[in-house]
Interface confidence: low
């Protein structure tokens, strides 16, 4: 099936700069399909902006200022790009790429969307390192002994912008584990967020990873925070009477 | 002109019930499609179901469409609601696939659906403290109802954050409150829930060792983040 990945979860720009958003198409040949771009401004309806067809024809929504958006595709990397020139406050939005995909019924099509990229406009120039700074919390003995389970907590601080994605995996498994998280909270000019994962006792001796996607991660790759395997048999327990 | 109207801005419904989301549209096209999408908090858009203007009412799993062509109404019903159905739902009108048009979708404003957990017996929380350096987390597990006050007890507070209270798959709640304290080793947590107080010390265990589970000896306990 056609799949769309938007590797940038956010793109932060200062006023009047140019933003370049990427959309990677897989499962389908980009030169044989049309790619569409939509935007969702805060509090507004999702709106079609521009498309590039399989033969390179570009179509823009009427009413969109000419020269504002530029759409392109690079067959070698199976990527479509949306370039937003001279960014201003009204360009703050989530931008989605999309394509039509045929369904099991003949001639039936659905439009599938990428996960979106949030365009953030800031008037500050943040020179400092604003990637997420991790702190790990290992399960308390009490929890592992009384509940035969353990909770790992992954705290991420001092990041900007606020757009962040966190998921958990067990080592040597690509399965995303069911975790929970708090809201992203503002602390001065940056943000913090935490996520926690509760695992059964039998999984405590496995390594777990808190995987963080953020615009300002070093080298643009997901940050993997390693939670070591723990052993729960080092202490004999005598729970207090409640 | 083509237009899509979703009059309900939000709707709440308990688990296991059904919810119907209304969508009206205007179009001059003789043949068209209506699509329903679910938007997750992460902003990800997931296709749910499509309704052709010349087709019988669409049905896919728990999603069904009540399509009234004359009234230009295309209501989505989600049956047997689950907690994970909480999201924003968009109705979109699809242009016919002519060579000269853009083949775009026209969206409604969306309806936010909140699925409430089923009412269940009151459950007392378990309370545990986790620490790393000056950071302390109070973990409060599996309580019902939701109302709770979490207090990290310390004489040397640096900063505290609002608690995160989230629903668990069981329909009970979990919460975490974080803070930074100079005397993190002496910090305890007390919780007011259902007119009772529960302390983290109620769950402590007698031990000759430190308060946290040991990493395996072979593991590096100073955890660098891998970039």
């Amino acid at each position: 099936a056609g799949h769309l990945e938007q590797p940038q979860i956010s793109s932060t720009k200062t006023l009047s700069k140019t933003a370049r958003l990427e959309c990677v198409v897989s499962g389908i040949t980009i030169s044989a399909t049309s790619v569409y771009w939509y935007r969702e401004r805060p509090g507004e309806v999702i709106q079609f902006l521009v498309s590039i067809s399989y033969d390179g024809t570009v179509r823009k929504e009427s009413g969109i200022p000419s020269g504002k958006f530029e759409v392109d595709r690079i067959p070698e990397t199976s990527t479509s790009t949306l370039t937003i020139h001279n960014v201003e406050k009204q360009d703050i939005a989530t931008y989605y790429c999309a394509l039509w995909e045929a369904q099991q019924e003949l001639g039936k099509k659905i439009k599938v969307f990428g996960p979106g990229t949030k365009l953030i406009i800031t008037d500050k120039q943040l020179d400092a390192d604003v990637s997420p700074k991790p702190t790990i919390f290992l399960p308390s003995i009490a929890e592992t002994k009384l509940q035969k389970a353990g909770t790992y907590l992954c705290l991420l601080e001092k990041f900007f912008p606020d757009v962040i994605k966190i998921h958990w995996e067990e080592k040597k498994s690509n399965t995303i584990l069911g975790s929970q998280e708090g809201n992203t909270m503002k602390t001065n000019d940056t943000y913090m967020k935490f996520s926690w994962l509760t695992v059964p006792e039998k999984s405590l001796d496995k390594e777990h990873r808190c995987i963080v996607r953020h615009e300002n991660n070093k080298n643009g790759v997901d940050q993997e925070i390693i939670f070591p395997p723990i052993k729960t048999d080092v202490i004999t327990m005598d729970p207090k009477d409640n | 002109a083509q237009k899509v109207t979703q009059a309900q801005s939000s709707v709440s419904m308990p688990v296991r019930k059904a919810v119907t989301l209304n969508c009206l549209y205007e179009t001059s096209w003789w043949s068209y499609y209506i699509f329903w999408y679910k938007q997750l908090p992460s902003k990800e858009m997931i296709f749910l179901i499509r309704q052709g203007s010349d087709e019988q009412n669409a049905k896919s799993g728990r999603y069904s469409v009540n399509f009234k062509k004359a009234a230009k109404s295309v209501a989505l019903t989600i049956s047997a609601l689950q907690l994970e159905d909480s999201a924003k739902y968009f109705c979109a009108l699809g242009e016919p696939n002519h060579f000269l048009n853009t083949d775009k979708l026209i969206f409604g404003k969306g309806t936010r659906v909140t699925v409430e957990p089923r009412s269940q017996p009151h459950t007392k929380p378990s309370v545990f403290v986790m620490k790393n350096g000056t950071n302390v987390a109070c973990l409060v597990k599996e309580f019902y109802p939701k109302d709770i006050r979490i207090n990290l007890v310390s004489s040397k507070k640096i900063t505290e954050f609002d608690p995160a209270i989230v629903i668990s798959p069981s329909g009970k709640y979990n919460a975490v409150k974080l803070g930074k304290y100079e005397d993190s080793n002496s910090v305890t947590c007390s919780v007011q829930h259902d007119n009772k107080t529960v302390h983290s010390t109620d769950f402590e265990v007698k031990t000759d060792s430190t308060d946290h589970v040991k990493p395996k000896e072979t593991e590096n306990t100073k955890q660098p983040s891998k970039s």
Epitope: T33, E105, L106 | S60
Partner: antibody, heavy 130, light 107 residues
Framework: EVQLVESGGGLVQPGGSLRLSCAAS????????IHWVRQAPGKGLEWVAS????????YYADSVKGRFTISADTSKNTAYLQMNSLRAEDTAVYYC???????????????????????WGQGTLVTVSS | DIQMTQSPSSLSASVGDRVTITCRAS??????VAWYQQKPGKAPKLLIY???SLYSGVPSRFSGSRSGTDFTLTISSLQPEDFATYYC?????????FGQGTKVEIK
């Protein structure tokens, strides 16, 4: 391993009825479409009917429309072809088949399912004769 | 309905020969064409889908091509196990239709 096994064929008089079954294993019929294709003795392949059990859509060849009904029981992971008002020209080996799961390019001029059939049953013979 | 006209209806060839079978669609089916091989008493086997894509496990001597509404199956070097009947199929729209078949016999 994906497998399709047809059953229910046999000798029937003109005007009679038969119900063919196609038991699937290795995949779920609810997540796929199932198609019936027949082959008269010494002749070529003829598509008969298709069902998309997730949506309930069914399609029929003109030669069987109104006489044959395709259905699926997702709990049994089985598709069926109910054949009524049978005629001599319905005599054939009936195969059920599953489409290859390779989704298509979307061309500007339209989309389609990639309904090339990669898995077929062994076939069941239906003979309509007095 | 879309007719698929297949030719020739039969051909005789020797091991090592290059064999070409063609199918003409009565109207556009884009690339929604498949080719099958069938041996007596057996179910058809998928060789080519999407006009030119080789199905997994099929020897590379089989290839498919498209020129407008004309579709071609080529066997670059005929092997003893290739003697069989070959069918084209369109699935660009319902009803799905097959060509009449081409029987490849030993010369």
């Amino acid at each position: 391993e994906v497998q399709l096994v047809e059953s229910g064929g046999g000798l029937v008089q003109p005007g009679g009825s038969l119900r063919l079954s196609c038991a699937a294993s290795g995949f779920t019929v609810s997540s796929s479409s199932i198609h019936w294709v027949r082959q008269a003795p010494g002749k070529g392949l003829e598509w008969v009917a298709s069902i998309y059990s997730s949506s309930g859509y069914t399609y029929y060849a003109d030669s069987v429309k109104g006489r044959f009904t395709i259905s699926a029981d997702t709990s049994k992971n089985t598709a069926y072809l109910q054949m009524n008002s049978l005629r001599a020209e319905d005599t054939a080996v009936y195969y059920c088949a599953r489409p290859y799961y390779w989704y298509p390019y979307y061309y500007w001029s339209g989309g389609w399912e990639y309904a090339a059939f990669d898995y077929w049953g062994q076939g069941t013979l239906v003979t309509v004769s007095s | 309905d879309i007719q698929m006209t297949q030719s020739p209806s039969s051909l005789s060839a020797s091991v090592g020969d290059r064999v070409t079978i063609t199918c003409r669609a009565s109207q556009s089916v884009s690339s929604a064409v498949a080719w099958y091989q069938q041996k007596p008493g057996k179910a058809p086997k998928l060789l080519i889908y999407s006009a030119s894509s080789l199905y997994s496990g099929v020897p590379s001597r089989f290839s498919g091509s498209r020129s407008g509404t004309d579709f071609t199956l080529t066997i670059s070097s005929l092997q003893p196990e290739d003697f069989a009947t070959y069918y084209c199929q369109q699935y660009g729209e319902y009803p799905i239709t097959f060509g009449q078949g081409t029987k490849v016999e030993i010369k």
